[in-house]
């Protein structure tokens, strides 16, 4: 004879376990239904009645099958230096990641707690190591024969142009100036701009515009200024 299908709640076999999407209720000593994502246990099961589930209340969520009495609260709204890459719904928490030009200075389990602006290398310095989602730009002084005349978080040191006749010699922050004959370069400059760090998560590059009558979707976290590294600017 085929084994009978047990309907929750039911007493498990001695030493047995409850099935998938069920849990063992210590008080009732029965196998009872879990609640699906987006819901929570409103009434726990008894020996004769199963778990009663209810939808998560506004701004709360459950991501897994569960029997929690209350859903978890979503995280705070994303700050203005962040992009909401996942909205708060009944089934998932909000995820905030840093917007382009910023990196995550303090991460959390998912997304970022605190973003900081990428360091900009001042003239005479170029990007030695580009910023990533979780690390700042590293600047280095331009070596002899190279220069950077910008304040940028992406520009590297470029080679001076080579002149047949030099009008003004180049230095770390200025290109050489040639007389009217056409100049050449000491080497191919390659990509002058390093790309912004690319997020592994798909990002909306622009948050939804906030209504004029209403709450924008963002606010600015007080990010304390970090001491500028050599060759960096606080801008």
């Amino acid at each position: 004879l085929p084994a009978q299908v047990a309907f929750t709640p039911y007493a498990p076999e001695p030493g047995g376990t409850c099935r998938l999407r069920e849990y063992y209720d210590q008080t009732a000593q029965m196998c009872c239904s879990k609640c699906p994502p987006g819901q929570h246990a409103k009434v726990f099961c008894t020996k004769t009645s199963d778990t009663v589930c209810d939808s998560c209340e506004d701004s709360t969520y459950t991501q897994l099958w569960n029997w929690v009495p209350e859903c978890l609260s979503c995280g705070s709204r994303c700050s203005s230096d962040q992009v909401e890459t996942q909205a708060c719904t009944r089934e998932q928490n909000r995820i905030c990641t840093c917007r382009p030009g910023w990196y995550c200075a303090l991460s959390k389990q998912e997304g970022c707690r605190l973003c900081a602006q990428l360091r900009k290398c001042r003239p005479g310095f170029g990007v030695a190591r580009p910023g990533t989602e979780t690390s700042d730009v590293v600047c280095k002084p331009c070596a002899p024969g190279t220069f950077s005349n910008t304040t940028s978080s992406t520009d590297i040191c470029r080679p001076h142009q080579i002149c047949h006749v030099v009008a003004i010699p180049g230095n770390a922050s200025m290109d050489a100036v040639c007389t009217s004959t056409s100049p050449t370069r000491s080497m191919a400059p390659g990509a002058v701009h390093l790309p912004q760090p690319v997020s592994t998560r798909s990002q909306h590059t622009q948050p939804t515009p906030a209504p004029s009558t209403a709450p924008g979707t963002s606010f600015l976290l007080p990010v304390g200024p970090s001491p500028p590294a050599e060759g960096s600017t606080g801008d």
Partner: antibody
Amino acid sequence: QVQLVQSGAEVKKPGASVKVSCKASGFNNKDIYMHWVRQAPGQGLEWIGRIDPATGNTKHDPKFQDRVTMTSDTSTNTVYMELSSLRSEDTAVYYCARSPYGDFGAMDYWGQGTLVTVSS
Amino acid sequence: DIQMTQSPSSLSASVGDRVTITCTASSSVSSNYLHWYQQKPGSSPKLWIYSTSNLPSGVPSRFSGSGSGTDFTLTISSLQPEDFATYYCHQYHRSPWTFGQGTKVEIK
């Protein structure tokens, strides 16, 4: 752009019912709540209740328990609030307002208000 | 129900003054669930500060909000003519959701 447009002013006799509508445009009714808030002349704001237009689930202040009915028509993006057994103290401007899911109940858009006068 | 009590109920101030309005909850409210609205005569309320301290776009930076637990504050650092209005606090922590009775900011 987001707009909440409410029905016009009403004059009702005590004991009658009134049904106020609020038509939403410029946003998706999914993952938002629509609230009803009233304001008696010269008084403060009083929350009546809210509806999830997608599911029809409602919640209201127990003081309106047996008198308020909130409904939604997703085909026209309109929500309704009906208040029955009207008395003179129900004279107020009735506002609808929306709060997006996940915004912790912040009501970011409000209708223009509907004046309901209860007078014999 | 959570009672929200605002003080003062009304205040008279001059342009340029620093103005502080307080809102006291009868039991603890999570800061994410505390909001402020501005209302001018004959107009609908507008969301003015959300989640205790955050300004919607279009709200001037002279406004700020702070607080936690049962005590919350709205501050105007330098009062401007367009700020004369009534301000309401609102808790969404526990149903039924409630508003303060309002604070009317008038011209001295």
